[in-house]
């Protein structure tokens, strides 16, 4: 979200000054070409300017940096490393800037960086060390508290010959750098599965958004260690049923609110436990909106209104009784 300061409080830099100044050490109150700056709000906006690289002459006071709607393509190592360092930079928004590669150490030398938004970039190549900065098995802790990675899946023809889920998870887990992460948004990424180790290594999570993916099952995912988790968004996935183990883990989390709208629930005999749970649990938000998608005879039935007699499975006939 953009800062509340009025546009008139931002000073704009004339484009023709850019080449003359970029080689010099930045002046304390200088504003990069094609950007708007407010020292009072500690904010720099370089928005929808088709920039192809991060400005070198960012003012040292910057706390909130918006580089959205550009054409950055690649974020190299030390993309924000400056002398003196951008020691105050706390919120960095790079959404919608056509990034397809983020290299190892891209966010190094940003000691105060708490919020990072890379949403709406087709990240075909996200280095495992993009957030940790090094390939050590245990890196220095990242200051990141909020990481927004919504809709970073590249078009299918641009994906590397590897699992996109695996690439993202490798970056989240490298060097255990993100142990302090409290908010993680991974919505709209076509995730088919959630690697089982990812949540166990992000113990500080308060908010996890996995909405609008293609998750079919949570059977191998454990939420048990996420004792601080406050919201879990699983809307608009491909979930068919939640099994007892998952129900028990969710029920036991002390702060949790779970969002399950718009999943294609399969209302057969395997749904009985979930329906029983839904009728009593208070952790599912808007549970009265959950409806069956399959089988056809159950479509649009409200889960809370089902009873055990409704939830049957067609018997599997022995081969000798099956008709051709």
């Amino acid at each position: 979200s953009s800062p509340t300061s009025s546009a008139s409080s931002f000073s704009s830099s004339a484009p023709f000054l850019a080449s003359a100044v970029s080689a010099q050490p930045p002046l304390p109150d200088q504003c990069p070409a094609l950007c708007e700056c407010s020292e009072a709000a500690r904010t720099v906006k370089c928005v929808n300017r088709n920039l192809t690289e991060v400005p070198t002459d960012l003012p040292a006071y910057v706390r909130n940096l918006f580089l959205t709607g550009n054409q950055l393509a690649v974020l190299p190592a030390g993309a924000f490393a400056r002398r003196p360092p951008l020691a105050e930079l706390a919120a960095l928004n790079l959404s919608g800037s056509r990034l397809d590669e983020v290299r190892a150490g891209a966010f190094e030398h940003l000691p105060s960086l708490r919020q990072l938004d890379l949403s709406h970039n087709p990240l075909a190549d996200l280095s495992p060390f993009a957030f940790s900065g090094s390939n050590a098995s245990v890196s220095a802790p990242s200051p990141l508290v909020e990481l927004i990675l919504n809709h970073i899946v590249p078009p299918e023809d641009e994906r590397q010959n590897r699992s996109f889920e695996g690439m993202v998870v490798a970056a989240l887990l490298a060097g255990r750098a993100l142990q302090g992460l409290r908010r993680l948004e991974l919505a709209s990424n076509h995730f088919l599965y959630l690697p089982r180790d990812v949540l166990a290594q992000l113990p500080s999570l308060r908010h996890l958004d996995l909405s609008n993916n293609s998750l079919v099952s949570l059977t191998y995912v454990s939420f048990r260690n996420l004792t601080h988790l406050e919201s879990l968004h699983l809307e608009d996935n491909a979930l068919k049923v939640l099994h007892n183990g998952t129900l028990a883990e969710l029920q036991g989390l002390p702060h949790i609110r779970v969002f399950l709208d718009n999943n294609p629930w399969v209302c057969d005999c395997h749904m009985a436990d979930m329906v029983t749970w839904l009728k009593e649990t208070e952790v599912v938000q808007g549970k009265d909106r959950l409806t069956c998608a399959y089988p056809e005879k159950m479509r649009n039935r409200v889960l809370l209104e089902l009873n055990s007699a409704d939830l049957d499975c067609d018997p599997i006939l022995p081969p000798s009784l099956q008709t051709s």
Partner: antibody, heavy 122, light 111 residues
Framework: EVQLVESGGGLVQPGGSLRLSCAAS????????MSWVRQAPGKGLEWVGF??????????ENSASVKGRFTISRDNAKSSLYLQMNSLRAEDTAVYYC?????????????WGQGTLVTVSS | DIVLTQSPLSLPVTPGEPASISCRAS??????????LQWYLQKPGQSPQLLIY???NVESGVPDRFSGSGSGTDFTLKISRVEAEDIGVYFC?????????FGGGTKVEIK
């Protein structure tokens, strides 16, 4: 810092009405279930009821002893919780506490106000 | 309604010594693997404060001399070494079913 401050208590005659208020601060009010608990002088605690959060439609549950007489409501714009008490009886005399439920409401109340005294007497 | 029975009604304690309070439920307060049983302390002239939730989880900021145990219908609150500031009335509460109910309370006082 989470804070809950009750007000509106006082002396009321049997059959009368009273409206208690609870001003909440320090948390996202709409995310949480809120409740009223009362304590008659020298007695134990009695759950009066709760009101659910935004995600669960702000619906309410009341104890049998107050059903049809007491109504729990909330004004989310003001981060305030209310207890409208009608047809009051002598046995409703108590300190009334406003309390916030934990994020998972099954774990009950984690923050309580200081209480407001309601005395029903002629 | 689920009835909670606390014992003892009154518990005289010596500072530095351990203390234990029992709470028994008329039916199980377990739901999908968690016992939804809380313990509160109400100090004289104050509001109740949460000590233990989910039978055994110590609330943040509560001294680690407090612990909770039990499952299903039988629960115990233990204070490993009682301090003078621990005096007051202790209540158990179940939130497994509506209506939520409280035990009658146990008054802990210094001998």
């Amino acid at each position: 810092e989470v804070q809950l401050v009750e007000s509106g208590g006082g002396l009321v005659q049997p059959g009368g009405s009273l409206r208690l208020s609870c001003a909440a601060s320090g948390f996202t009010f709409t995310d949480y279930y809120m409740s009223w608990v009362r304590q008659a002088p020298g007695k134990g605690l009695e759950w009066v009821g709760f009101i659910r959060n935004k995600g669960n439609g702000y619906t309410t549950e009341n104890s049998a002893s107050v059903k049809g007489r007491f109504t729990i409501s909330r004004d989310n714009a003001k981060s305030s919780l209310y207890l409208q008490m009608n047809s009051l009886r002598a046995e409703d005399t108590a300190v009334y506490y406003c309390a916030r439920y934990r994020g998972n409401p099954h774990y009950a109340m984690d923050y309580w106000g200081q209480g407001t005294l309601v005395t029903v007497s002629s | 309604d689920i009835v909670l029975t606390q014992s003892p009604l009154s518990l005289p304690v010596t500072p530095g010594e351990p203390a234990s309070i029992s709470c028994r439920a008329s039916e199980s307060v377990e739901f999908y693997g968690t016992s939804f049983l809380q313990w509160y302390l109400q100090k004289p002239g104050q509001s109740p404060q949460l000590l233990i939730y989910g039978a055994s989880n110590v609330e943040s900021g509560v001294p680690d001399r407090f612990s909770g145990s039990g499952s299903g219908t039988d629960f115990t609150l233990k204070i490993s070494r009682v301090e003078a500031e621990d005096i007051g009335v202790y209540f158990c509460q179940q939130s497994r079913k509506v209506p939520s109910t409280f035990g009658g309370g146990t008054k802990v006082e210094i001998k």
